[in-house]
Each structure stands twice: as structure tokens, then as C-alpha cells.
Amino acid sequence: AILGRSETQECLFFNANWERDRTNQTGVEPCYGDKDKRRHCFATWKNISGSIEIVKQGCWLDDINCYDRTDCIEKKDSPEVYFCCCEGNMCNEKFSYFPEMEVTQPTSNPVTPKPP
């Protein structure tokens, strides 16, 4: 293991559509993947008139947007469905929303921006 990195082996699992999808509604999900790839946890939720409705929680595949994030925080401004990802076992138990200032996109096709 690399020093200072939280390896993710399991995440909190939740599925609001568990009946339709024929899954459990809630539990702990073991995260599978190639041994040399990073694994993460995620949470998705909706804010309906100030009421938080969790959509899904579970494991997320190797994603640079999630690297070295110990907390699950959505930073996008007012998305339709909120999404956050993090590293570390069960790091998706808690999630939060801290919108960043919207930066105007350049007119040319953007390339890899610096991660926040």
C-alpha cells in the first residue's frame, strides 16, 4: 500500500430502486477490481424541496476525480442528481454538498483541468 492513501475494500451500499433492480436495499458492498487499480465509494442523492433522497451508494471504479478524497463531497453547482466519491472503507456513509464558484468554460474544447 502507498503511504497516505486510503485503500477502499468496502463501501456502504444503498439502492432506492432495489425492488426494480432486484438487489438488496442496504448493506455493505465489497469492492472488486484489478489489483493495481484504485477503488472508491460513491453516493448519489436528490434534493427535493429541501428534502434529501438518497438514490444509490456503493463502490466506484478507478477515477482520478476521487483520488485522495477522504470525504464524499459534491462540488458541482445545483446538479439534478448529486454525486460524490471518496477513498477509504465506508467513506460514503456521510456525504455533503459544497458548491464551488462556477468557472466559465473556455471556447475551445477543454483539456484536463487541474483537480480541485
Partner: antibody, heavy 115, light 111 residues
Framework: QVQLVQSGAEVKKPGASVKVSCKAS????????INWVRQAPGQGLEWMGT????????SYAQKFQGRVTMTRDTSISTAYMELSRLRSDDTAVYYC????????WGQGTLVTVSS | QSALTQPASVSGSPGQSITISCTGT?????????VNWYQQHPGKAPKLMIR???KRESGVSNRFSGSKSGNTASLTISGLQAEDEADYYC???????????FGGGTKLTVL
Amino acid sequence: QVQLVQSGAEVKKPGASVKVSCKASGYTFTSSYINWVRQAPGQGLEWMGTINAVSGSTSYAQKFQGRVTMTRDTSISTAYMELSRLRSDDTAVYYCARGGWFDYWGQGTLVTVSS
Amino acid sequence: QSALTQPASVSGSPGQSITISCTGTSSDVGSFNYVNWYQQHPGKAPKLMIRGVSKRESGVSNRFSGSKSGNTASLTISGLQAEDEADYYCGTFAGGAYYGVFGGGTKLTVL
């Protein structure tokens, strides 16, 4: 094993729309992104956009903004790419690929735009 | 026009080593280790060979290696074999806050 299976070849007239599907299996569909890439005959790869399979959030290449729509149906582990107002230079093979690293690819769907 | 620049073609004899370059800018290739390399044989879908500059995908021969210096990423193939003849593309991670981009592709000919 991970598989992405795409819909069959399409022939469309200029001005029409096409919708290509990409059915995923062998992994949890809602655990990553699906990216879409196209390749015109004899040309290189061109990134079109991406969809977060769990949240449905999308990012499109500027070139396709306003003409492309990416959606997914999590109940059948399938992603879709719809391209509207087709022109002859949209003739290409369209690929879906899993995740931000494009680690698995569909077999490709040939879309021919011809009057 | 590609944001990443590759040579149109390279060639080598069996057993030789070749290197394909992929040049970007200080804000993409130069800043992050998020460049990947794909191999594409005629009529086939691309295949991920190297991700994150230098990590070989499982099942990929150790004859393939990736590196980076400044704003240029490189793919080196040692001990060239006939089956290595293909098109090779560099590309970036795409998803979330990151927009994808590919190089123009390099045709490798094994003489």
C-alpha cells in the same frame, strides 16, 4: 468478463437522428462512466462525451454540444448516444468505452449518413 | 485538430525497439499522469495498453512501456514483433471534471 455490446449498423439520411445503444455486462454498470468515441473512415479517434452511469451527469465535447445526447437505463445496464441533424461527415464507427480510462470497448457501430 | 500531437508513422524491424511520442501542453500532459495508450488493429476496436503514463494493463506484454518527460508522453515497444503492427493512440482520462482528447494516431509498420 466485462463486455460492452453495441447495436447494429445504421444507414441514415442527412438531417435525421441516430441512437446507438451499448449494453454492459460483467461488472456493476452504475460503478463508472461510459465514454463515447467515434472514428471516421481512415481517420483517428474522436472523443464525443461521457456519462456518469449512476447519476446520469454528462459532459460533451464542444464540437458536439447541442447535437449529442447521452442517456442510460440502469435497469438494463445500457447506455445510449443520440446524434441529431446528421451530416455526411458524421459517417463513422461509434464506440462506447467503460470508465475514464477507456479500459473496455464495445465492438463499434457503423453509422452511414447518405442521401 | 488534435490537442495531442503524435507522429503520423513510425517503422522498425523485428527485434528492434521503437518509441512513439505524444506531445501536449503544460496544462494537460505536463501537469498530470493521466495519459493512456491504445492499440488498434485494422477493423477492430481500440485496446487499452498503458494507463496513467506507465501502468501496463493486465495481459499486456512487458515489451510495452510508457514514460513521460515534460509535456511529452512516450510509448516504447521493445523486441518488435509482426503482431505489433497497428495504429497507436494516446489519450487522456475522461469523466467528471475531465474532458477527453486523443492524439491523431501513429501507424506502426514492422518491416
